[in-house]
């Protein structure tokens, strides 16, 4: 049984060349003719030289799964989903992705280091100490109050509340 | 003795339109493919469309696709290429070639010149 | 699409010589490349089918030669009616049918 060069397909005892991206086989090689292609169908693709008899089915973006569709499917490219705002995908597949989560949200005691993406989770840091953070979205710790000369420190400052201070 | 003979071409505005023909004489003209390959002026050759042996199926490059039509007349051994919405960069000799089997092409007729200019 | 580029661009020779001419695809093809010589205002004419056959009627000082992604075409030597331009076709994946460039073989 022949090897096929790259970019071949083995039919029978034969190699044929493969049809172009966007193009199935329609009819394999022969001694006088060469592989005779025909284009996708619609909602059909193949991304790469192939001998399929077939192009694949485009991918559908499940908006159930927190999808929405960032690139329509082509003859010759696949579906491209993204995450819908606020989420970032879990399970990427080269440019595919198929579920993604919600952007975690940065608890008390720390502030948003870095927002998240359609491809990344949002990066929470701690907050340093003398600031505070009640969590959320918040991209800066707030520093501690400074209770007036007028007033007593009830509580200490922590990573997650301010200084309460009374008047004396 | 094979004779392939196109005909329709001329000048034309751009946006109009124009119908070749290809008459065949000299040899069974309905078992075989037929294509048309053009050549723009002091440049090389470029495939245009093939129809099958049977007419059912027909191929377009992606530069003419939407505004080419190519058809046959078995009864009159007669091949068509109908060019609409046609562009400046459609100027080109048009010639009809007999195809094996969609693939290499033995027979050529002579061209018709298209010129397609306001 | 399979993208065929011939070299040179331009080969001055004198009758008598050999003259090779090559002809890459970009992917493989197969056996399923043709030859065609071109002479000013007149069709292409074919010479070479599948690589390597030459078709009826055309003089045995052709030939051809190669597959998958490299091939030659040969003039074993030149006959004043050999010079033309001369251009490669694939057919192993189709459509679309792509052509070389040309070669242009001039008398030196």
């Known amino acids: 049984q022949p090897s096929c060069r790259q970019e071949e397909f083995l039919v029978g005892d034969e190699c044929c060349p493969m049809c172009n991206p966007g193009y199935h086989v329609k009819q394999v090689c022969s001694e006088h003719t060469g592989t005779v292609c025909a284009p996708c169908p619609p909602q059909t693709y193949t991304a790469h030289a192939n001998g399929l008899s077939k192009c694949l089915p485009c991918g559908v973006c499940d908006p159930d799964m927190g999808l929405l569709t960032w690139q329509e499917c082509s003859s010759w490219k696949d579906t491209v989903c993204r995450c819908i705002p606020g989420y970032f995908c879990e399970n990427q597949d080269g440019s595919h992705c198929s579920t993604c989560l919600q952007h975690t949200t940065c608890p008390p005691g720390q502030r948003v280091e870095k927002r998240g993406t359609h491809d990344q989770d949002t990066v929470c840091a701690d907050c340093l100490t003398g600031t505070f953070s009640l969590g959320g979205t918040q991209e800066e710790c707030l520093p501690w109050t400074n209770c007036s000369a007028f007033q007593q420190e009830v509580r200490r400052g922590t990573n997650s509340t301010d200084t309460t201070c009374s008047s004396q | 003795e094979v004779q392939l003979l196109e005909s329709g071409g001329g000048l034309v505005q751009p946006g109009g339109s124009l119908r070749l023909s290809c008459a065949a004489s000299?040899?069974?003209?309905?078992?075989?493919?037929w294509t048309w390959v053009r050549q723009a002026p002091g440049k090389g050759l470029e495939w245009v469309s093939t129809?099958?042996?049977?007419?059912?199926?027909?191929y377009y490059a992606d530069s003419v696709k939407g505004r080419f039509t190519i058809s046959r007349d078995n009864s009159k051994n007669t091949l068509y290429l109908q060019m609409n919405s046609l562009r400046a960069e459609d100027t080109a000799v048009y010639y009809c070639?007999?195809?094996?089997?969609?693939?290499?092409?033995?027979?050529w007729g002579q061209g018709t010149l298209v010129t397609v200019s306001s | 699409e399979i993208v065929l580029t011939q070299s040179p661009g331009t080969l001055s020779l004198s009758p008598g010589e050999r003259a090779t001419l090559s002809c890459r695809a970009s992917?493989?093809?197969?056996?399923?490349l043709a030859w065609y010589q071109q002479k000013p205002g007149q069709a292409p004419r074919l010479l070479i089918y599948?690589?390597?056959s030459l078709q009826s009627g055309i003089p045995d000082r052709f030939s051809g030669s190669g597959s998958g992604t490299d091939f030659t075409l040969t003039i074993s030597r030149l006959e004043p009616e050999d010079f033309a331009v001369y251009y490669c076709?694939?057919?192993?994946?189709?459509?679309?049918?792509?052509f070389g460039q040309g070669t242009k073989v001039e008398i030196k």
């Open positions: 070639a007999h195809d094996r089997t969609f693939g290499y092409f033995d027979y």
């Open positions: 000299g040899f069974t003209f309905s078992g075989y493919y």
């Open positions: 129809i099958s042996a049977s007419g059912d199926s027909t």
């Open positions: 992917r493989s093809v197969g056996k399923y």
């Open positions: 599948a690589a390597s």
């Open positions: 076709q694939q057919y192993g994946s189709s459509p679309p049918i792509t």
